[in-house]
Interface confidence: medium
């Protein structure tokens, strides 16, 4: 088992909104849960966009999930990752 490296980034979207993206890379096996949570509970599927789980050329995999949130509410959102029985939570950078 190779645990993922998780990285959260933010980018400007429309006025008053930002897009936050959570990327998991260099993990094996390919089964992974990656989702955005608000106040600790998972957002619905239709408010998130997922990338495919793709091989990254080193025998490991990568994927991402993104969502749009209101600027100023970043603290309420975290990226939750679960892989091979381990989990971690990652905040939006300020």
């Amino acid at each position: 088992t190779v645990p993922p490296m998780v990285n959260v980034t933010r980018s400007e979207a429309s006025e008053g909104n930002i897009t936050v993206t959570c990327r998991a890379s260099s993990f094996y096996p390919r089964n992974i849960i990656l989702t955005w949570r608000q106040d600790g509970v998972s957002l619905s599927h239709d408010t998130q966009q997922w990338g495919d789980v793709l091989p990254d050329g080193n025998g490991t995999y990568q994927t991402w999930v993104a969502t749009r949130i209101c600027r100023g509410e970043e603290a309420r959102f975290t990226c939750y990752m679960e892989h091979s029985g381990n989990h971690s939570t990652h905040p939006v950078p300020s």
Epitope: R37, Q38, D39, G40, V41, S44, R76, T78, T89, P91
Partner: antibody
């Protein structure tokens, strides 16, 4: 389930600050959201704010943003709430409570501390 | 803020009776993830509140099956099928769907 042990009663003067503690045991502290709630005698409850122990991220009820400050000490598995510029309106019982998102429930205040009585009086 | 209104304020019951408590929210309390985070708590004198029901109708662990929750949208109900002495106290409904999360004013269940 675990335990949540709150600090003892406080008698403080108007204008002062108080720092309440909520020491936890029996569960993985860093996986948890801890909320603080206020209850004035004979009244209902008010949610003040939550803090996520894993990151220190917080979300406040706007009513309390200038009044409350939440922190955690992961080394001692303790959550804190500092309440500032106290007035008699702040006299109440303050509870800490743990959210239960990692089980099957998705419940907000699944486990509670015993409460801390804060009395503000000159 | 979402206003949670509970009725009645006081509910006198005889032991063994069925009790029905009502909670109405000032707006729809469906969270953006599709769940309705409506909960019921019981607070006995001198004690911390205890969670009974989460997500409208799910009993929390250890809660007897005489407690049941129902409702949707803005109208919710807690029923106690056969009231026992240990059920007496103040019941609060709570919504955790919209920040700030808010409680109802409470219904006091007491002996008739």
């Amino acid at each position: 389930q675990g335990q949540m042990q709150q600090s003892g009663a406080e008698l403080v003067k108007p204008g002062a600050s108080v720092k309440l503690s909520c020491k936890t045991s029996g569960f993985t502290f860093s996986d948890n959201y801890i909320s603080w709630l206020k209850q004035k005698p004979g009244q209902s409850l008010e949610w003040i704010a939550w803090i996520y122990a894993g990151t220190g991220g917080t979300s406040y009820n706007q009513k309390f943003t200038a009044k409350a400050q939440l922190t955690v000490d992961t080394s001692s598995s303790t959550a804190y709430m500092q309440f500032s510029s106290l007035t008699t309106e702040d006299s109440a019982i303050y509870y800490c409570a743990r959210h239960d998102y990692y089980g099957t429930s998705g419940a907000w205040f699944a486990y509670w501390g015993q409460g801390t009585l804060v009395t503000v009086s000159a | 803020d979402v206003l949670m209104t509970q009725t009645p304020l006081s509910l006198p019951v005889s032991l063994g009776d069925q009790a029905s408590l009502s909670c109405r929210s000032s707006q729809n309390i469906v969270h953006i993830n599709g769940n309705t985070y409506l909960e019921w708590y019981l607070q006995k004198p001198g004690q911390s509140p205890k969670l009974l029901i989460y997500k409208v109708s799910n009993r929390f662990s250890g809660v007897p099956d005489r407690f049941s929750g129902s409702g949707s949208g803005t109208d919710f109900t807690l029923k106690i099928s056969r009231v026992e002495a240990e059920d007496l106290g103040v019941y609060y409904c709570f919504q955790g769907s919209h920040v700030p999360w808010t409680f109802g004013g409470g219904t006091k269940v007491e002996i008739k």
